[in-house]
């Protein structure tokens, strides 16, 4: 099918664009081309006789188009107006026509863009900017920049006008900027010139420094105002109320008790119309007063809050030193000072911090101290202690607990039995005690500052017979060579003898085996595998005795080297090669073969049928103990000789 | 000012796929738009591609579109100019151009350039 194809279908204005023919029939008396979409004398540009070689001009013809032999067009120095549909009649030698219709869209180079404003210096907070890219130009697209980074997203950014125009609504002083803008179409891109923003705002509230408002007779005053605000706020200076003068600066030459008062600063920005003042009370001493700490937090609580000293007043040009403990302040990570050494910074308090606290300021002949300050740091309760820490009484004795938690303000206590309430007293006294004063004795300790509230239980048994003991540990499986254990026999009973028995002995004598406790803890240090064993422990008093069950003690070792049976490492050619690798471990080890280096299979046994001269080698089998964390191997060596060449040599299995 | 310098030329066959790189110096290489040009001996400078600051916009000759492309990197200060289905008829001095106001296929609009660098396609 005969089609227009063309090249570029964006032309440039000035530029050339070609109309290519494709798909052109053969036998053809000639052609010609029209502007628009059908065929229209009027709008003939250029026609085309094959058999003359003879082009004619038509009435749309321009002077610029040129017509090739395979029936293309090229127009050249295009203009704006030559954008649009064009026709190209084909006249075969049969007389039968044939159309087709191509098309091209011409964009002009476009301007340098220029950025236009409603607003050459809004204010802050107040005012809405609206920049306008110029021209206004037919087919093209609208791109913004700020500080050559594409638009923010932000509520206060509007873009209208087919992106045209870029509104900033209750502009900021963080909207001055640089803003570009740029105009594309299919040919080229332009950007503007940038523009800055500039915002009116201000003044802020000023600041008045330095900041210390303690100074002694015969200093200098040096004052100084600063206020955020564009354009630069302009400055005055009153004293207690009376105007002083209109400078950034106040500076007063030997001040006496008599410039003490309120000094203010104003500061006014003369385009937004706008005032801010600052008051700062400055002291005159005729002499360094005595120093007194301010504390930001007189009831700070444990762990939690931070605690900041200040060393009162604030002077001028003065050294301030500090004591804890009557003790200069040792070096802590929780203890800082600030840059001119008034503050101290307790940071996470603790019980410990309690002080007292002096600081002090220095002058040219002596050290001026404060009064002692004294933390009082609120902590606990911790966990309640109940003691004495016998479980175990006979009946007919008085039963006498008491319960301590270390607590500030101190702890409040209640008792209670199986969960019953039963007093609210740090003591606990039951006399003539039964059977039935058995049961859990709860100790509540409550600190009504922090709010915080711990409790321990304790079982109470209360029996003429001892009870069967019965062994904890501290490590169920402990490795050998490497860690110990400790055995305690529980219960914990008044007037009771403990004795241990290993696998129905007396204990050995061994450094390796100690007890501690009233003999009631047995530690095994450094435990070997022959330390498995039961150990049994006992209690008696003057009317029963009570033996524990066994405990055996689990015991992690090795793995041990491993041996690789049978022995042989020569075999014949033929035979069954059957290799056993078993290590001394406790859990089993896993096991794994390797051949010349070769992983094979993670069995415990290695079976190979029918072996050869090839199955020569290194034989390795690596043994594994999860539970000790510890490997070991061995490697032997076999040797695979053809049948019948040696005697005497093993058959194999 | 900024100042460029072109890279990566050299010869290749019919076919093959070259990438010239263009390193930029001396000013903020985001406030450049940036365009390739070609010269061929004994023939007038001719444009190849262009692209805009931001890299959003891209234009390109006739005669190698959808062969090259053209793409910078603000971070790393440098112009890309992927050519692949390279033919002879791309053999030419490749030159590499900036503007702080204009992207396009004319050359006027651009006031700085390169050295150049020689690409040669030939079996």
């Known amino acids: 099918k005969l089609t227009i194809e063309s090249t570029p279908f964006n032309v440039a204005e000035g530029k050339e664009v070609l109309l290519l023919v494709h798909n052109l029939p053969q036998h053809l008396f000639g052609y010609s081309w029209y502007k628009g979409e059908r065929v229209d004398g009027n709008r003939q540009i250029i026609g085309y006789v094959i058999g003359t070689q003879q082009a004619t001009p038509g009435p749309a013809y321009s002077g610029r188009e040129i017509i090739y032999p395979n029936a293309s067009l090229l127009i050249q120095n295009i203009i704006q107006n030559d954008t649009g549909f064009y026709t190209l009649h084909v006249i075969k030698s049969d007389l039968v026509n044939e159309e087709a219709t191509g098309q091209f869209r011409v964009y002009p180079e476009l301007p340098k863009p220029s950025i236009s404003s409603n607003n050459s210096k809004p204010v802050e907070d107040k005012d809405a900017v609206a920049f306008t890219c110029e021209p206004e130009t037919q087919d093209a697209t609208y791109l913004w920049w700020v500080n050559n980074q594409s638009l923010p997203v932000s509520p206060r950014l509007q873009l209208s006008n087919g992106n045209r125009t870029l509104t900033l609504f209750n502009v900021t002083r963080n909207d001055t900027a640089s803003y570009k803008c740029e105009t594309q179409n299919p040919v080229s891109a332009r950007r503007s010139d940038s523009v800055i923003l500039n915002v009116l705002y201000g003044p802020d509230a000023p600041t008045i420094s330095p900041l210390n408002t303690s100074y002694r007779s015969g200093e200098n005053l040096n004052l100084s105002c600063h206020a955020a605000s564009n354009p630069p706020a302009q400055y005055s200076w009153f004293v207690n109320g009376t105007f002083q003068q209109s400078t950034q600066e106040l500076f007063i030459p030997n001040i006496t008790v008599n410039n003490s008062g309120s000094y203010t600063c104003q500061a006014h920005n003369s385009d937004t119309g706008l005032n801010r003042t600052t008051v700062t009370t400055i002291t005159v001493y005729a002499e360094p007063p005595k120093p007194f700490i301010t504390s930001n937090n007189s009831n700070p609580v444990e762990d939690e809050d931070a605690v900041a000293l200040t060393c009162e007043p604030e002077i001028q040009n003065t050294t301030y030193l500090w004591w804890v403990n009557n003790q200069s302040l040792p070096v802590s990570p929780r203890l800082q000072l600030s840059n001119d050494n008034r503050t101290l910074t307790l940071l996470s308090v603790t019980r410990n911090d309690v002080g007292p606290y002096e600081c002090g300021i220095q002058n040219e002949l002596s050290v001026d101290h404060s009064d002692p300050v004294i933390l009082n740091v609120l902590y606990g309760p911790d966990d309640p202690t109940i003691s004495p820490s016998y479980t175990y009484y006979r009946p007919g004795v008085n039963l006498s607990l008491s319960c301590h938690a270390a607590s500030n303000p101190p702890a409040q206590y209640s008792w209670l039995i199986d969960g019953n309430i039963q007093q609210h007293t740090q003591e606990l006294f039951i006399s003539n005690i039964t059977e039935k004063n058995s049961g859990l004795y709860t100790c509540q300790a409550n600190n009504s500052a922090s709010g915080h509230s711990r409790t321990t239980v304790k079982t109470i048994t209360v029996s003429a017979e001892l009870p069967k003991p019965s062994i904890s540990s501290n490590n169920s499986k402990p490795v050998e060579d490497k860690d110990a254990v400790a055995f305690t026999c529980e219960p914990e009973a008044q007037n009771t003898t403990y004795l241990w028995w290993v696998n129905g002995q007396s204990l050995p004598v061994s450094p390796r085996l100690q007890l501690s406790n009233g003999n009631r803890t047995l530690t095994l240090f450094n435990v070997t595998r022959n330390d498995a064993r039961a150990y049994v422990c006992g209690i008696q008093n003057s009317v029963s005795a009570n033996r524990s069950d066994p405990v055996t003690l689990d015991v992690l070792y090795g793995p041990d080297t491993p041996i690789i049976s049978p022995p042989d490492s020569s075999y014949l050619s033929g035979a069954n090669l059957n290799l056993s690798c078993h290590s001394a471990s406790n859990p089993s080890p896993q096991y794994s073969w390797r051949i010349n280096g070769i992983p094979q299979q993670h069995t415990q046994v290695l079976f190979i049928a029918k072996i050869t001269p090839n199955n020569n080698g290194t034989y390795a089998c690596f043994v594994s103990n999860l539970a000790t964390g510890r490997n070991n191997s061995i490697v032997k060596s076999i040797t695979v000789s053809a049948s019948g060449t040696s005697p005497g040599l093993s058959a194999g299995a | 000012e900024v100042q460029l310098v072109e890279s990566g030329g050299g010869v290749v066959q019919p076919g093959g796929s070259l990438r010239l790189s263009c390193a930029a110096s001396?000013?903020?290489?985001?406030?450049?738009?940036l365009g390739w040009f070609r010269q061929a001996p004994g023939r007038e400078r001719e444009f190849v591609a262009a692209?805009?600051?931001?890299?959003?916009?891209?234009y390109y000759a006739d005669s190698v579109k959808g062969r090259f492309t053209i793409s910078r990197d603000n971070a790393k200060n440098t112009l890309y100019l992927q050519m692949n289905s390279l033919r002879p008829e791309d053999t030419a001095l490749y030159y590499c151009?900036?503007?702080?106001?204009?992207?396009?296929?004319?050359?006027?609009?651009?006031?700085?350039w390169g050295q150049g660098t020689l690409v040669t396609v030939s079996s």
């Open positions: 692209i805009n600051w931001g890299g959003g916009w891209t």
């Open positions: 151009a900036a503007s702080s106001d204009y992207a396009g296929g004319n050359p006027t609009g651009y006031p700085y």
């Open positions: 001396g000013h903020t290489f985001s406030e450049y738009a």
